[in-house]
């Protein structure tokens, strides 16, 4: 399910429960995706020892995964709500091709991988409603994404395992960073 439990119509209709605010819905959605990533990481970490390797040992890769930096306005120092929101949405849009790559990369967690992908699409929609400056958000080029996907899928098994691990770790960190920032907004 792309939306966490407690979000469906019958649940919202419960008389004792206040409907979630936009911020609460976004917060819950991110936590739901992070839980999904956690389950996927369990499978990848059980298959290889990459999770124990230091970041430096895995840093040499050609992946251009989105990453938060000081200039993005999402950190405590130099916090800027509007700049940060644009970065979060742009970053999530850039992650979509990598989430597509993750499909078919899992044996026992195939549905979980799909749920993470679909939930991220829903999260982007929630955030786009919150953003005022939608013009500043650049959407990745579909042709570039298609060729990147082809290239990633053509890698040997070891590199594919490494890529899977790096995507999950980077996406987790990006979402955690986004959550910290959104909770300050």
């Amino acid at each position: 399910a792309p939306v966490p439990p407690g979000e469906d119509s019958k649940d919202v209709a419960a008389p004792h429960r206040q409907p979630l605010t936009s911020s609460e819905r976004i917060d819950k959605q991110i936590r739901y995706i992070l839980d999904g990533i956690s389950a996927l990481r369990k499978e990848t970490c059980n298959k290889s020892n990459m999770c124990e390797s230091s970041k430096e040992a895995l840093a040499e890769n050609n992946l251009n995964l989105p990453k938060m930096a000081e200039k993005d306005g999402c950190f405590q120092s130099g916090f800027n709500e509007e700049t940060c929101l644009v970065k979060i949405i742009t970053g999530l849009l850039e992650f979509e091709v990598y989430l597509e790559y993750l499909q078919n990369r899992f044996e026992s967690s195939e549905e979980q991988a799909r749920a993470v992908q679909m939930s991220t699409k829903v999260l982007i929609q929630f955030l786009q409603k919150k953003a005022k400056n939608l013009d500043a958000i650049t959407t990745p080029d579909p042709t570039t994404n298609a060729s990147l996907l082809t290239k990633l899928q053509a890698q040997n098994q070891w590199l594919q395992d490494m890529t899977t691990h790096l995507i999950l770790r980077s996406f987790k960190e990006f979402l955690q960073s986004s959550l910290r920032a959104l909770r300050q907004m």
């Epitope: 936590r31 124990e52 999402c74 950190f75 979402l175 960073s177 910290r180 300050q184």
Partner: antibody, heavy 120, light 110 residues
Framework: EVQLVESGGGLVQPGGSLRLSCAAS????????MTWVRQAPGKGLEWVGM???????AYANSAIGRFTISRDNSKNTLYLQMNSLRAEDTAVYYC??????????????WGQGTLVTVSS | DIQMTQSPSTLSASVGDRVTITCQAS??????LSWYQQKPGKAPKLLIY???TLASGVPSRFSGSGSGTEFTLTISSLQPDDFATYYC????????????FGGGTKVEIK
């Protein structure tokens, strides 16, 4: 053995500076979020600051502008640079490892602490 | 900013007693709360996280409950080793705060 060992504490004059170190062993520091917590003599625990994955940091109000957390992944060591020290900064300083697996901060591995005394 | 208020600050109890410590957050923190035990001259030890999940190696006499702003740590039957100071800690947001920890509760022998 998985452990954290703090060092660098001591006596320093008000207005002075000090750099604390926290050496990690048995795990790679770069894979975890790390925090500093302090405890004044006879008082409770006080969170000081945190360093996240992409060198993002967060600080308690009392530490903003005076304290800086950094790490050297090649040395597997965490640092706390403390400037403009005041008498109220006197405390045992602990470094701790955050679980990092989820979104909420929780500290599941602690060092033994190092005492910082700010006095003239 | 989020403030954590713990009560009582001191609690006198006997071995075998059921002990309850409460922690209140100034705003909702979901279930993002941890409990720690600290003995004199020692570093704190994580007991419970996510409000109710027992940390590895922690005896089952310890339990946690609560969500939103009200949380409880319960020791079902106090043991000699449990006389210590207990702290709650919010993990929801570490920005613009004075402290993530509650003021502490000292559990002493009656």
């Amino acid at each position: 053995e998985v452990q954290l060992v703090e060092s660098g504490g001591g006596l320093v004059q008000p207005g002075g500076s000090l750099r604390l170190s926290c050496a990690a062993s048995g795990f790679s520091l770069s894979n975890y979020y790390m925090t500093w917590v302090r405890q004044a003599p006879g008082k409770g625990l006080e969170w000081v600051g945190m360093i996240y994955g992409s060198d993002e940091t967060a600080y308690a109000n009392s530490a903003i502008g005076r304290f800086t957390i950094s790490r050297d992944n090649s040395k597997n060591t965490l640092y706390l640079q403390m400037n403009s020290l005041r008498a109220e900064d006197t405390a045992v300083y602990y470094c701790a490892r955050d679980d990092s697996s989820d979104w909420d901060a929780k500290f599941n591995l602690w060092g033994q602490g190092t005492l910082v005394t700010v006095s003239s | 900013d989020i403030q954590m208020t713990q009560s009582p600050s001191t609690l006198s109890a006997s071995v075998g007693d059921r002990v309850t410590i409460t922690c209140q957050a100034s705003q909702s923190i979901n279930n993002e709360l941890s409990w720690y035990q600290q003995k004199p001259g020692k570093a704190p030890k994580l007991l419970i996280y996510r409000a109710s999940t027992l940390a590895s190696g922690v005896p089952s006499r310890f339990s946690g409950s609560g969500s939103g702003t009200e949380f409880t740590l319960t020791i079902s039957s106090l043991q000699p080793d449990d006389f210590a100071t207990y702290y709650c800690q919010q993990g929801y947001s570490l920005r613009n705060i004075d402290n993530a920890f509650g003021g502490g509760t000292k559990v002493e022998i009656k």
